[in-house]
Amino acid sequence: IWELKKDVYVVELDWYPDAPGEMVVLTCDTPEEDGITWTLDQSSEVLGSGKTLTIQVKEFGDAGQYTCHKGGEVLSHSLLLLHKKEDGIWSTDILKDQKEPKNKTFLRCEAKNYSGRFTCWWLTTISTDLTFSVKSSRGSSDPQGVTCGAATLSAERVRGDNKEYEYSVECQEDSACPAAEESLPIEVMVDAVHKLKYENYTSSFFIRDIIKPDPPKNLQLKPLKNSRQVEVSWEYPDTWSTPHSYFSLTFCVQVQGKSKREKKDRVFTDKTSATVICRKNASISVRAQDRYYSSSWSEWASVPCS
Amino acid sequence: RAVPGGSSPAWTQCQQLSQKLCTLAWSAHPLVGHMDLREEGDEETTNDVPHIQCGDGCDPQGLRDNSQFCLQRIHQGLIFYEKLLGSDIFTGEPSLLPDSPVGQLHASLLGLSQLLQPEGHHWETQQIPSLSPSQPWQRLLLRFKILRSLQAFVAVAARVFAHGAATLSP
């Protein structure tokens, strides 16, 4: 058993049929010695008396809010949550496996630049009695500070018969050094509590590996005289790190016909303009990627050819 | 060439070669690293590689103030990785397929380090740890880790030379 926060405790249980469970001793936080009784949740049934209560925690029915009273007055509470371990593996019932980029990916994170700011998100099908708390650091043995906000519900989607809820959190490294080569990864830890079930999820990454620039901005076409060619131009996204002579992007320009089956013409360039042939009913799209490190491409910015 | 005593390197040449290094490092190992290393003896094997750290003056302001600190750090790293790529980790078994880009990568690391330091001038270099695995397949794990960290190192070096070519070239 360990303390998650004040008056909230997590009991770690090996979860199998007829498991013996864990013996837990609760102590009433009071100077009083006599006349103390214990109850669980809303029940008025007295579970025991005395300053301490010893219980055998085996299942969710044994978890909940234990309260000690004296003469009708509440003295203190202890909330017990359960953390299940099945076949040596901690349960992952609360969050959905996003399976990208690999199986058992529960947390996904992205950064728009090298400033040390990043966003993580996760999915669940649970809609109520759900709380999350997020902690982060750079490195684990001698951790350096990363500050995370509160996790918020950022999207709801319908998937078949199920509703899916996306939560996200923003974090900022306290003393980020955008130009340095990271040697210690960022660690993100999410505590998830659903009713009386506790789970924790972790992710470890370098900012450089989760970079995904915003799409290029101000995408414009300029027809070239007496030609089917056009000059496409664009600018670095506002959110990208500066100076651009140091934090450079490379770009992919694509001409795509109306039909998905039509052949795509692609040009790669380090410049912020390119000359392409504009076909009727086609669209021109541009996306960006770090020039020197192959992290994710941005989403496409697009304009119609006409 | 970088000349002892703090004069400028050939920024544009260094820019071109460092960008080529980035391309080669990614062609040698294109994955962004989703190999399952958990069941391999994942002891920390590449913690001793030289990293370009915050105080090394490789940020735009530091380069403007005095690029020599940063160039020396880059040079140290290039020599370190050049030695690693020429070591038993990459030459031992399992041997690399004949068309492996590691040979080119090795030569380019040497080429860029020579651009930064002409004959007769010596910056101190870091000792490379002797990592000769007793199990042949462990070399794959070491290669994986070395190339992942080389990709990060050459990305910073390429940014330095691109910025230098754009803002510090005579």
């Epitope: - | 190999m35 399952d36 391999e40 038993d88 078994e93 399992p94 041997s95 397949w137 794959l140 994986f144």
Partner: antibody, heavy 126, light 111 residues
């Protein structure tokens, strides 16, 4: 064509040593390894060790605790396996085999003992 | 050392029937969680062994009645329709860790 030709059968006394040779032809000797495998009469195969002339790396089966020495002479494309302190249980056919062991930079690719010598019967008897 | 245990020791199968040979490793012989460093060799009487499966992939020229499967610690070589020329002893070999180790062999005969 690729050939591995081993030296002839040997009868040895307990406590003595034997040195079996394996002459390779038909390929670039230093581009491959040589593996030594033995097979006692009516028994299975036992890996003794492997030598890669290009890198100079040699891998041994510790079971033989310093009794086995594997060498290669690049000038004559010949590999050797010497086994000392012979005992009766060392009576076996000793094979050399060409080892091809390659990978992409970071991924397993191929390991094959693709060509074998004809075998050398070593009999240890007093 | 990784111990490779083959079963059965011998197997008598009618011509055209299926033969299944098992090989169990005392610990995982997977590399990076995906590729199995496991190989199958066929040895006919009076001959040196011949490679038929390498890193769980068939060698070229091996008839497609042979198939290899398994991962981690448990592997199987199957001959879907036994032919007279398949009579031999079959060995599995792991090369995940030095010393590389062979299984004890499975003798396949015609019933």
């Amino acid at each position: 064509q690729v050939q591995l030709v081993q030296s002839g059968a040997e009868v040895k006394k307990p406590g003595s040593s034997v040195k079996v040779s394996c002459k390779a032809s038909g390929y670039t000797f230093t581009s491959y390894g040589i593996t030594w495998v033995r097979q006692a009469p009516g028994q299975g195969l036992e890996w003794m060790g492997e030598n890669y002339p290009r890198s100079g790396n040699i891998y041994y089966n510790e079971k033989f605790k310093g009794r086995v020495t594997i060498t290669a002479d690049k000038s004559t494309s010949t590999a050797y396996m010497e086994l000392s302190s012979l005992r009766s249980e060392d009576t076996a056919v000793y094979y050399c085999a060409r080892a091809e062991f390659i990978s992409t930079v970071v991924a397993p690719y191929y390991y094959a003992l693709d060509y074998w010598g004809q075998g050398t019967l070593v009999t240890v008897s007093s | 050392d990784i111990v490779m245990t083959q079963s059965p020791d011998s197997l008598a199968v009618s011509l055209g029937e299926r033969a299944t040979i098992n090989c169990k490793a005392s610990k995982k012989v997977t590399i990076f969680g995906s590729t199995s460093a496991l190989h199958w060799y066929q040895q006919k009487p009076g001959q040196p062994p011949k490679l038929i499966y390498n890193l769980a992939k068939p060698e070229s020229g091996v008839p497609d009645r042979f198939s290899g499967s398994g991962s981690g610690t448990d592997f199987t070589l199957t001959i879907s329709s036994l032919q007279a020329e398949d009579v031999a002893v079959y060995y599995c070999l792991q090369n995940k860790e030095v010393p590389y180790t062979f299984g004890g062999g499975t003798k396949v005969e015609i019933k």
